[in-house]
């Protein structure tokens, strides 16, 4: 039961997260302009990733794409390239945990092979996680950078008379939005990779059981193959379960290892 | 058609104050800034200030804060200013207009002319 | 505040004739936003309000003769009437529109030699 829970949860958790990444990528507000200096504009300045805008005090929004690629800077392309294999990945480790969930049965799917896409989608949302914290934080060291430096040249001197006040911009709504998607869907990640360890537990997991056939004796090892058949007739391994209840959860039919290239 | 149409000429005694109205049709009132401008006889034009009729924001020349104040009347589509401690300086006509794309003013009023004398 | 500073003062030219004025500011009056430049013109006839010319430095408002064109960026713009008409004279006031508080320049008056 608390496997299913983690895995139910870590789902929902990374969903949340990667639909947070894909408004943040979408979104106009990276970088707002700083109003300390002036709380009151005329021309409220934003920009993001795909394009910039200026809300006018008028009430009017007026936005332009970035119609260029290779005239913009290299590493908001690079925050670009971060977010949208973040959000390839996130999509990706969804399609692939939806047929790893437990309550979700298809076909005669070996516990093993939910187990391995368990593990499969849970390192996927944790790269995308990753891939989505690291764009941001890149996009926000950037304005930190060209925060400080227009704060140097606040006012440039054009002939004495005539100054051009450079305009400063700060964190945008974007920028938390990425941070905690990211966040979460790293914890999804996490989560479905603990499920993962529960869907499919190792041989030392089981109970070692003593069987007695009569007349011979017959020792199992806690490792649930048969270890010494004495002289038994019985030559084939078997897997022994102790007979208490168990949940849906902790039975298994086969241990499996988890090799992820 | 869009039509701004501004209460008539006032003639006041130093130290009194004056409300001035703008009627406004032929658009959705609430969804333009009211701005005010200001021109005193063979001078040039000073913006005032300017209101918003959905919530009554304004913003104001920190010039006319202790001058002029603005406000609307949802039910009648009208914007108000007034100004108080009327001097002779305040002799002008006063315009209210609406505020377009580019912070630009589209449509103004026919103008009101207040006169200050003692 | 910006500073909005027009030349000449007046300016007098034949019926047909192109003319020119000239608006400089104080400041910047580009928004690195949509990179439009928040410089308004005005026409202003005797005993009439304002009437809109051309907003975001270049646009000409719905029902102006596209014989006014609105030129310049950054804080050097230009008002140019390719072909004066008798209906032209009056007084030009450019506006900033970029930051509070919105301001004019002194005006150009227009007239005909």
């Known amino acids: 039961m608390a496997v299913t829970a983690c895995q139910g949860l870590g789902f929902v958790v990374s969903l949340i997260g990667i639909a947070g990444i894909i408004a943040a990528t979408c979104m106009d507000q990276w970088s707002t302009q700083d109003l300390y200096n002036n709380p009151v504009t005329a021309v409220f300045n934003y920009q993001g990733l795909w394009r910039s805008c200026v809300r006018e005090s008028s009430g009017f929004t007026e936005c332009r794409g970035y119609f260029t690629l290779l005239g913009l800077p290299a590493m908001l392309q690079a925050v670009r390239a971060l977010m949208i294999v973040g959000i390839v990945l996130g999509a990706i480790g969804l399609l692939v945990s939806i047929f790893a969930l437990k309550c979700i049965r298809i076909g005669s799917m070996e516990d093993s092979a939910k187990a391995n896409m368990t593990l499969t989608s849970g390192i996927m949302f944790i790269v995308s996680g990753l891939c989505a914290i690291a764009g941001v934080s890149v996009f926000a060291n950037m304005l930190v950078t060209n925060f400080w430096m227009s704060t140097a040249n606040m006012y440039t001197g054009m002939g004495g008379m005539v100054q051009t006040v450079q305009t400063r911009y700060t964190f945008g709504a974007a920028l938390f939005v990425g941070w905690v998607a990211g966040g979460l869907t790293l914890i999804g990640g996490v989560m479905m990779c603990i499920a993962c360890r529960g869907l499919a537990p190792e041989e030392t997991n089981y109970k070692a059981v003593s069987y007695h056939a009569s007349g011979h004796s017959v020792a199992y090892k806690p490792g649930g193959f048969k270890a010494s058949t004495g002289f038994g007739s019985n030559t084939k391994n078997k897997k022994i379960y102790d007979g208490g209840a168990r949940t849906e959860d902790e039975v298994q039919s086969y241990p499996s290892k988890h090799d992820y290239v | 058609q869009v039509q701004l149409v501004q209460s008539g000429a006032e003639v006041k005694k130093p130290g009194a104050s004056v409300k001035v109205s703008c009627k406004a049709s032929?658009?959705?009132?609430?969804?333009?800034?009211v701005n005010w401008v200001r021109q005193a006889p063979g001078q040039g034009l000073e913006w005032i200030g300017m209101?918003?009729?959905?919530?009554?924001?304004?913003r104001l020349n920190q010039q006319f804060k202790d001058k002029a104040t603005l406000t609307v009347d949802k039910s009648t589509s009208t914007a108000y200013m007034e100004l108080s401690s009327l001097r002779s300086e305040d002799t002008a006509v006063y315009y209210c207009?609406?505020?377009?794309?580019?912070?630009?003013?589209?449509?103004w009023g026919q103008g009101t002319l207040v006169t200050v004398s003692s | 505040d910006i500073v909005m500073t027009q030349s000449p003062d007046s300016l007098a030219v034949s019926l047909g004739e192109r003319a020119t004025i000239n608006c400089l500011s104080s400041?910047?009056?580009?928004?690195?936003?949509?990179?439009?430049?928040?410089l308004t013109w005005y026409q202003q006839k005797p005993g009439q309000p304002p009437k809109l010319l051309i907003y975001?430095?270049?646009t000409r408002d719905s029902g102006v003769p596209d014989r006014f064109t609105g030129s310049g960026s950054g804080v050097d713009f230009t008002l140019t009437i390719s072909s004066v008409q008798a209906e032209d004279v009056a007084v030009y006031y450019c506006?900033?529109?970029?930051?509070?508080?919105?301001?004019f320049g002194q005006g150009t008056k227009l007239e005909i030699k």
């Open positions: 207009a609406r505020v377009w794309s580019g912070n630009a003013f589209d449509y």
């Open positions: 032929g658009y959705s009132f609430t969804n333009y800034w």
């Open positions: 209101v918003h009729p959905s919530g009554s924001e304004t």
């Open positions: 400041q910047s009056l580009l928004a690195s936003g949509n990179q439009r430049n928040y």
């Open positions: 506006q900033n529109g970029f930051s509070f508080p919105f301001t």
């Open positions: 975001w430095a270049s």
